[in-house]
Every structure is written in structure tokens, then in C-alpha cells.
């Protein structure tokens, strides 16, 4: 799902507004590209990425990709346009304020990806199943 922002083009740039018509600034995201990670078997992890970047385009969201194979674990943090696939996958959760990891099928490795649309939201990546809910009351309890 693409975030529920109205988009219009000016000089080939997307001007993104929220539901109230206020201009939405480009996202601030953690942006360390691919780094080795020690995040493993945890409900959530911090990215340990010291680079906070403004995204190039207002429509971009924050993305985190966690990968584990026989040799290492990596965490990738970037900005990306949710209208475009990333690692061949659609960013289904781009409107989420939290980066809730979902497993994707990739041969030869364990591959999780999340996307989110609040500032630096890819700094805290969440694996725990209890966060993967569509129940807003439960979300309220969890995030308080």
C-alpha cells in the first residue's frame, strides 16, 4: 500500500501532502546501505547506523533489509520510493510508522524486509510476531 498522501507533480518533482493538505517533507531515514550486523534472534534491534539522511524525494520512505546466510548477517538501511520494487519486492507496509520486519522468500538465505514512513523509523527494526497485527487496540497497548 502506498502511503495515503496526495501527490502532484511540479517541475517533474512530486509534491506530497498529507490528508489535511499540509506539505509533507521528505523523510529522514537511517542510510548506511549494507553493513555487517550482530542482530540475531531478537524481538527488535537498533540499526547502529550513525547516518541520518534526508531522502532525495518527498515520496520516498525508509527501508531496512536484514539478511542472514551461512557466512554473515547484514542490515541494509536506505530511502526508497514505495512505487518501485526493492530487491524485487513491493514495499507493502510503506505507510506504517514502525519498521515491522516481514520474511521474504530468497533462496540460500533468510531475508526480512520492512518499510515505514516516520522519521528515522528504520533505526528500530521489529521482528516480534506480536507487532504483526492489524488490531489497533493491541497496537496501542504495545506501543505505549
Amino acid at each position: 500500500t502506498i502511503p495515503p498522501h496526495v501527490q502532484k507533480s511540479v517541475n517533474n518533482d512530486m509534491i506530497v501532502t498529507d490528508n489535511n493538505g499540509a506539505v509533507k517533507f521528505p523523510q529522514l531515514c537511517k542510510f548506511c546501505d549494507v553493513r555487517f550486523s550482530t542482530c540475531d534472534n531478537q524481538k527488535s534491534c537498533m540499526s547502529n547506523c550513525s547516518i541520518t539522511s534526508i531522502c532525495e524525494k518527498p515520496q520516498e520512505v525508509c527501508v531496512a533489509v536484514w539478511r542472514k546466510n551461512d557466512e554473515n548477517i547484514t542490515l541494509e538501511t536506505v530511502c526508497h520510493d514505495p512505487k518501485l520494487p526493492y530487491h524485487d519486492f513491493i514495499l507493502e507496509d510503506a505507510a506504517s510508522p514502525k519498521c515491522i520486519m516481514k520474511e521474504k522468500k530468497k533462496p540460500g538465505e533468510t531475508f526480512f524486509m520492512c518499510s515505514c514512513s516516520s522519521d528515522e523509523c528504520n533505526d528500530n527494526i521489529i521482528f516480534s510476531e506480536e507487532y504483526n497485527t492489524s488490531n489497533p487496540d493491541l497496537l496501542l497497548v504495545i506501543f505505549q
Epitope: N11, N12, T52, S53, I54, C55, K57
Partner: nanobody, 111 residues
């Protein structure tokens, strides 16, 4: 080594004007989106203005009509012209450009 350096801040009376500069080295600003952020005392950082490579600039509602961003590509500098300043504009102002480049900030006090 990429560096962004803000300057031009200071103490100004309400209704006054300031022009902030963001000078870059190690990066060509004409090929980058550049944004101005500010952090009022004891508050969260907030977006002020965002200037895209193609020249489209968006402004926060709180500064629209009072603040203007301009670029001088020859000087590799981006400016934030601030008019009709209000006490609530008091903050440390930062410029930033992808990927992850931030200046040290310049203090603006309206009092």
C-alpha cells in the same frame, strides 16, 4: 571530506530579517536536494524548507510567505532568507543534503 557550514544567525527583533548561508565543500550542491531544518529549544527538530535539484521548493506552513530558499551554484551555497521573524522562529538552524550530510547549525534568536 564533505562539509556543510551554516552562518548568518544572530539576535534579531521581531519583524526583522536574517539571511542564513549553507556553504558546502566536498559536495556539489547543484546536484543535490538541500533542506533546512530547525530545532527550537527543548523541542524536536522540524523541517523548514526543502529545495529539490530541479528548483521546486516546499516550505513548512509556519514559514510560508516569510522564508525563501535560493541557490548560488557558483559559490556552492544555499541561502535561507528569513523575513518577518517571530519569537517562535528562535531555534538552531541546520542545512542538510543527501546522503547524511549535516552542518553544525547556526543559532537564530528572535527577541
Amino acid at each position: 571530506q564533505v562539509q556543510l557550514q551554516e552562518s548568518g544567525g544572530g539576535l534579531v527583533q521581531p519583524g526583522g530579517s536574517l539571511r542564513l548561508s549553507c556553504a558546502a565543500s566536498g559536495i556539489i550542491l547543484s546536484s543535490k536536494a538541500v533542506a533546512w531544518y530547525r530545532q527550537p529549544p527543548g523541542q524536536q527538530r522540524e523541517g523548514v524548507a526543502h529545495s529539490s535539484v530541479s528548483g521546486t521548493t516546499i516550505y513548512a506552513d509556519s514559514v510560508k510567505g516569510r522564508f525563501t530558499v535560493s541557490r548560488d551554484n557558483a559559490k556552492n551555497t544555499v541561502y535561507l532568507e528569513m523575513n518577518s521573524l517571530k519569537p517562535e522562529d528562535t531555534a538552531v538552524y541546520y542545512c542538510t543534503a543527501p546522503v547524511g550530510h549535516w552542518g553544525q547549525g547556526t543559532q537564530v534568536t528572535v527577541s
